[in-house]
């Protein structure tokens, strides 16, 4: 799978993780620290 | 699947505001960014800021700073593109467009005319 | 704010021509640049994403290419279905559009 960095713009849209560019899904995904879970890494579960 | 159903068109008189609404279904908004973007009868396209409805944060074009104002309720899954200080330049179809995890996803436009 | 110039504004080919419309940016955008075809009383409709990622139903004879800042739309053989006018989009840093290239039938 071709992964990139997401566009300036996407700056901030993962809140705990980074934002990364599936290129071959043509998606932006955010890859969440541990403890995060949810589209925008928005929610933290124990 | 998922939609973004824009209002109905609008007149209206010139110095007046016009506030146009975008209404999501089969998404939440707080997974996405909206986008506002117009094109004037004849004209291009002209991108006009966006919101992180998330965040509640919004970035406007240079030339629409202090004129326009965009807003998004998450609990009606709704974003909201206010106009103020209209003039006949502002007559155009409005579009918001949805973007995010997958690319652009666009309204079905609202016209908005400016006439006296 | 990035600018993108587009070019040509206008032009007319003959059906079976290549077609090249070209984009450039004030800075490099990495890439992230969008290509849409728009025909009188639509709305814009997306053919390619992050330079040359054609979306799913649409014709192979569009394809994008480029890197920095400068881009280029390709339309292999041109048919009577692709009158419209095309757009550039930047979305690396905010949003900008090019100004259009109208395609017509000569």
């Known amino acids: 799978v071709s992964i990139t960095k997401c566009n300036s713009d996407m700056n901030g849209y993962c809140l705990h993780g980074q934002c990364i560019y599936l290129v071959d899904m043509s998606q932006n995904y955010c890859r969440c620290e541990v403890g995060y879970t949810g589209v925008r890494c928005e929610h933290f579960y124990l | 699947q998922d939609q973004l159903v824009q209002s109905g068109a609008e007149v209206k008189n010139p110095g007046a505001s016009v506030k146009v609404s975008c209404k999501a279904s089969g998404f939440n908004i707080k997974d996405t960014y909206i986008q506002w973007v117009r094109q004037a009868p004849g004209q291009g396209l002209e991108w006009m800021g966006r919101?992180?409805?998330?965040?509640?944060?919004?970035k406007y074009r240079e030339k629409f700073e202090g004129r326009v104002t965009i807003t998004a309720d998450t609990s009606t899954n709704t974003a909201y593109m206010e106009l103020s200080s209209l003039r006949s330049e502002d007559t155009a179809v409005y579009y918001c467009v949805r973007s995010g995890r997958e690319f652009d996803f666009w309204g079905q436009g609202t016209l908005v005319t400016v006439s006296s | 704010d990035i600018q993108m110039t587009q070019s040509p504004s206008s032009l007319s080919a003959s059906v079976g021509d290549r077609v090249t419309i070209t984009c450039k940016a004030s800075q490099d955008i990495h890439k992230y640049i969008a290509w849409y075809q728009q025909k009188p009383g639509q709305a814009p409709r997306l053919l390619i994403q992050y330079t040359s990622t054609l979306q799913p139903g649409v014709p192979s004879r569009f394809s994008g290419s480029g890197s920095g800042t400068d881009y280029t739309f390709t339309i292999s053989s041109l048919q009577p279905e692709d009158i419209a006018t095309y757009y550039c989009?930047?979305?690396?840093?905010?949003?900008?559009f090019g100004g259009g290239t109208k395609v017509e039938i000569k």
């Open positions: 919101i992180d409805p998330l965040r509640r944060q919004t």
């Open positions: 989009l930047q979305y690396d840093n905010r949003r900008t």
